[in-house]
């Protein structure tokens, strides 16, 4: 990780931007450091990578320096807490964040013993904050699932940390790939299960369409067909945004036919950017594209009480647009305009030529 022996406030803020933080006792003003076998409270100004923590998958708390997760040993719950392998089944690795308290199972919460070791106890309440963030709550950094693209697990979220090449990775990596694409494992041990997917990569927005996008040569638009994934509308929307794109908008019949052709072998319904999440605005494209072309299925019910607020595209239906409950899980298509051109320059817009 290359963390300096003492973390500057600026460096600390950089880590916090990545969801990595130092846990400080609100009352004692000291910070949790992971040692070889126990956790202790130390001077926060001597912050080092063994003081850096990150919320990971399955409510885990991962220590960067120690490459392990905070665990509660049920056979000796009052003993000082320690780090364990993050997929250990011998201890409880799940922690909840609640009003500055870190709580485990059976009402155990993270406390401090008289000797400055960190223990789990039911007796007292101890409050923890994020050091260097002006008393900020460590709950602000809670883990959010990062859904994969392509790969072999149909859009399953990354498992953090995952072990690859004898190292525990708490974020996506480019390691082991000649094409330099970001990836993660979707189970805790890559070599054992070989389950993986690409990660949404914001930097890929700069280079245009890499191998996980398909380019329409006529329009300078790239599409990503996630036809085996199964995400809610908002998860799909986030996945596209994280890659510098948006959920699919359809500006004309030419674009619709391009999408149809690329889905021809699949009888599938996919999320597109059409939504009425703003009830005052009704149906809109999430990328702001104006509604100059519509292809609603006649079966769609537009009565106000209908709670289907997100739009889908069905390649196997001529009237292809339908509405669905946004929490349904479906495949999805992302769209990205190349070269940062104002998308209204390249978005179809030639409908009168067809008539």
């Amino acid at each position: 990780e290359g963390v300096a022996a003492a973390l500057t406030p600026e460096r600390l803020l950089e880590w916090q931007d990545k969801g990595i933080f130092v846990i400080q006792s609100e009352s004692l003003k000291k910070c949790i450091q992971a040692g070889k076998s126990v956790l202790t409270l130390e001077n926060c100004k001597q912050a080092n990578k063994h003081m850096l923590w990150k919320w990971v998958s399955n409510h885990g708390l991962f220590n960067i320096g120690g490459s392990g997760c905070l665990g509660l040993n049920f056979s000796a719950p009052e003993q000082p807490l320690s780090l364990y392998e993050c997929d250990s089944t011998l201890v409880s690795l799940r922690w909840r964040c609640n009003r500055k308290m870190i709580t485990g199972p059976l009402q155990y919460s993270v406390q401090v013993a008289h000797d400055n070791t960190v223990v789990a106890s039911r007796k007292y309440i101890h409050k923890w904050i994020s050091y260097g963030s002006g008393g900020g709550d460590i709950c602000e950094y809670l883990h959010k699932d990062l859904h994969t693209i392509k790969g072999n697990t149909h859009g399953m979220p990354c498992m953090f940390p995952f072990q690859y090449n004898h190292q525990w990775h708490h974020e996506c990596t480019r390691e082991g790939r000649e094409d330099d694409l970001l990836w993660c494992a979707t189970t805790s041990r890559y070599e054992r299960d070989e389950k993986w997917g690409f990660c949404p990569d914001p930097t890929s927005a700069e280079v245009g369409c890499d191998t996980i996008w398909e380019k329409d040569l006529n329009s300078h638009i790239c599409y990503q067909f996630n036809l085996l994934s199964s995400l809610s509308w908002s998860e799909a929307h986030s996945s596209c945004q994280m890659q510098g794109g948006t959920l699919l908008s359809i500006t004309d019949e030419t674009e619709e036919n391009f999408i149809r052709e690329h889905m021809s072998s699949k009888t599938v319904e996919v999320w597109m950017g059409l939504n009425q999440l703003d009830e005052h605005a009704g149906w809109q494209w999430s990328d702001g594209t104006p509604l100059n072309y519509l292809n609603w299925s006649p079966e769609v019910n537009f009565e106000p009480f209908v709670e289907d607020h997100c739009g889908t595209f069905s390649s196997f239906m001529p009237s292809a647009w339908r509405s669905r409950d946004c929490e349904s899980t479906l495949p999805y298509i992302c769209k990205k305009y190349l070269n940062h051109i104002d998308h209204e320059i390249v978005e179809g817009g030639h409908h009168h030529h067809h008539h």
């Epitope: 619709e256 149906w283 292809n295 104002d342 209204e344 179809g348 409908h351």
Partner: antibody
């Protein structure tokens, strides 16, 4: 042949709400986008907003806080409400239909406003 | 919000002459542009949509061109009934806007 007819009071007091209705005859209101436009005396056209029966609406940002456009498919009508009016809202108010063309498949392209009402003059005065 | 600017504000021409009206958008609207004609005391009438397609019943002396930000309405030979105010309107954004109008008057 499609016809649009605006109706509503010609005189509204300052700070009150202006309410106009546009009655559509000759076609189903469900097939199109419908719009309101106004024109102050001696001035140009100002777009107020549009609505589609699916629920899609869009309003001129300068009027958004005061305007509501609604649609009643059972009566084949759509309406405009403009609250907290002042003398600056004195204008001829037009309702209009947005034209459409069938695509080669099952979709439709929508374009400019191809059918207009004759307009109704609204004066804001006490 | 996309601002539409029309020029000139007034065009003084004689019947039979060619009229060229300009409309410029503050950002690209692709070809999502319409032209309207308005005579005193009347509602506007759609002339052109999609920047260059003539609306139903519009004589072929009216033609539109342009794409992106610059558009032109041309009346090849002015007839007496063509003297009116002409407006452009963009629908390349969900927030529609009109130009301020060009008045074509008899010289």
């Amino acid at each position: 042949q499609v016809q649009l007819l605006e109706s509503g009071p010609g005189l509204v007091k300052p700070s009150e709400t202006l309410s106009l209705t546009c009655t559509v005859s000759g076609d189903s209101i469900s097939n199109y986008f419908w719009s309101w436009i106004r024109q102050s005396p001696g001035k140009g056209l100002e777009w107020i907003g549009y609505i589609h029966y699916s629920g899609t609406v869009s309003y001129n940002p300068s009027l958004r806080s005061r305007v509501t456009i609604s649609i009643d498919t059972s009566k084949n009508q759509f309406s405009l409400k403009l609250s907290s009016v002042t003398a600056a809202d004195t204008a001829v108010y037009y309702c209009a239909r947005r034209g459409r063309i069938a695509a080669a498949g099952t979709g439709y392209y929508y374009y400019g406003m191809d059918v207009w009402g004759q307009g109704t003059t609204v004066t804001v005065s006490s | 919000e996309i601002v539409m600017t029309q020029s000139p504000a007034t065009l003084s021409l004689s019947p039979g002459e060619r009229a060229t009206l300009s409309c410029r958008a503050s950002q690209s609207v692709s070809n999502y542009l319409a032209w309207y004609q308005q005579k005193p005391g009347q509602a506007p009438r759609l002339l052109i949509y999609g920047a260059s397609s003539r609306a139903t019943g519009i004589p072929d002396r009216f033609s539109g061109s342009g794409s992106g930000t610059d558009f032109t309405l041309t009346i090849s030979r002015l007839e007496p009934e063509d003297f009116a105010v002409y407006y452009c309107q963009q629908y390349g954004s969900s927030l529609w806007t009109f130009g301020q109008g060009t008045k074509v008057e008899i010289k």
